[in-house]
């Protein structure tokens, strides 16, 4: 149905209306002035309206809420707490705002929130309890099933302590929010693309046992040595395209081999085809885990550039070649 036009806020709240004892039917649900509302579709869109905060008078029927492209910089605790609560809100899209800070308990009082998108916000301060709601060592489980955090890395000049240290701090901040109090143990989809991640914090994934889909594409991951996928027994899709991976070691390959349903996507990484690649090549030739394995080609050394990994033999893989300086750190 067509979006309802915005109705000016009435001074009488629904609760006050009922208490007045009037027998008149309640008015149609209000729609905030900067939004478009469709009760039939249970959708409210407040898009590109330069909003500085979450509208106060959101209709309680809302199931899908789009608050994209606004000017909100801080999401305070209880930003969506309403009376009556927004009990039916399932999908909340806050992408493309200017959010720098998401406070502890920002999403409290949203018992049905299944999908949250905070992408394209320069988050310098993501509270460890943003998704947990409390600082208990084991908090009540969040209802979240899908968490979309693509491109939430702040620009370099907004990160703490310069570039490398700032990235480590940023990764640690995101990891802390994801593991806090085991709140996200029901999360099945996590997107963390385009965040300049250099490494995966060791225990990032340990607290997310229900994950089926993990998107880490377009980061700067050089190695997966310290990451553990062992606990992700339900993992079906792992996207690692467009990173800086040079080789995969036996420990990682063995973990993937132990995951029953997983598909791993590895295209567009600068594979270094030297003697350290032998285990990975042998594994690739045997595995069904990597759907795009025929697309994987060597980037270095120069004499091997563009050579398909699946065609390599151990005799092709030596460690005599000089690598570019940028590839000599592991």
């Amino acid at each position: 149905s067509a979006p309802s036009s915005s109705v000016p806020s009435s001074s009488t709240s629904p609760a006050a209306f009922l208490a007045s004892g009037s027998a008149q039917p309640p008015p149609a649900e209000r729609c905030p002035a900067a939004c478009e509302c469709s009760e039939a579709a249970r959708t409210v869109k407040c898009v590109n309206r330069n909003l500085l905060e979450v509208p106060a008078d959101l209709p309680p029927y809302v199931r899908n809420l789009f608050l994209t492209g606004n000017q909100m910089t801080v999401l305070p605790a209880g930003a969506f707490a309403r009376q009556p609560p927004l009990a039916d809100l399932e999908a909340l899209n806050l992408s493309g705002n200017h959010l720098k800070e998401v406070c502890a308990g920002a999403f409290e009082h949203l018992p049905g929130l299944r999908r949250l998108d905070l992408s394209h916000n320069p988050l310098t301060n993501l509270s460890a309890f943003a998704f947990a709601g409390s600082n208990a060592s084991v908090s009540a489980p969040s209802p979240l099933e899908e968490l979309i955090l693509n491109h939430i890395v702040p620009p370099e000049d907004q990160r703490q302590n310069g570039s490398f240290e700032g990235m480590v701090a940023f990764e640690g901040m995101v990891a802390a929010a994801l593991r806090s109090g085991l709140a996200l143990r029901g999360l099945t989809r996590l997107e963390l693309a385009s965040n300049h991640f250099l490494f995966l914090p060791r225990d990032l994934l340990a607290q997310l046992p229900s994950l089926r889909y993990l998107d880490l594409r377009n980061n700067s991951l050089v190695s997966l040595t310290y990451a553990s996928f062992r606990n992700l027994t339900h993992l079906e899709s792992l996207h690692l395209e467009d990173n800086a991976l040079k080789v995969l070691h036996n420990s990682t390959l063995a973990e993937w081999h132990g995951l029953a349903h997983v598909k791993v996507f590895l295209d567009n990484n600068p594979w270094v085809c030297d003697c350290y690649m032998a285990d990975m090549v042998a594994w690739l030739k045997e595995t069904e885990v990597v759907p795009d394995k025929a697309r994987l080609t060597c980037a270095f050394p120069e004499k091997m550039r563009n050579r398909g990994l699946l065609d390599l033999n151990s005799s092709d893989l030596d460690c005599d070649a000089v690598l570019p300086q940028s590839l000599q750190t592991s």
Epitope: A294, T297, A299, R305, N306, G308, D311, L312
Partner: antibody, heavy 116, light 107 residues
Amino acid sequence: QVQLQQSGAELMKPGASMRLSCKATGYTFTGYWLEWIKRRPGHGLEWIGEILPGRGSTNYNEKFKGKATFTAETSSNTAYMQLTSLTTEDSAIYYCARGGRDFDNWGQGTTLTVSS
Amino acid sequence: DIQMTQSTSSLSASLGDRVTISCSASQGINNHLNWYQQKPDGTVKLLIYYTSSLHSGVPSRFSGSGSGTDYSLTISNLEPEDIAIYYCQQFSKLPYTFGGGTKVEMK
């Protein structure tokens, strides 16, 4: 050194089919993607698709599915592209190139003219 | 498909000039960009791969730069043998796509 030698120019009638060849020397033929590219005046370069000879894996540009088919004969280090149901739109120069992430060696091109 | 646009279809320059050819992608391509030279006789050569790496045997007067959606090829000191059509090509996503080409001519 790497060389890709393509078959000679062809004049074909509309509705016919034809097969272009590309013979590779100077490298491990099975280990690199072999690309096919179309060049028409006013249209620049268009990627048709690719084949990995050692495995027979192929990727096609959706636009050329049903028009082009790639095969490779590893015994002779030769790749082939079959073009079917030729029309005047298929008149072009067709290149093969050694591929992967970049196309670092190109054949000299085969000119195909489709005319009644 | 990712569209590649070379906004200048042809340009004239003098010997020794610095020539810059631009190329833009319809979405971010993560530096997955190559540059090719097509000579008047139809031969095609790779010049630059992965945005800025000079292919072996290519003169150092050629250089590439860019990021995100915007890329460029620079010829620092134009020589007669540089008369050609220059194409950019993305390899970020299949199908690979080329720009429309920029023809470099002598004044």
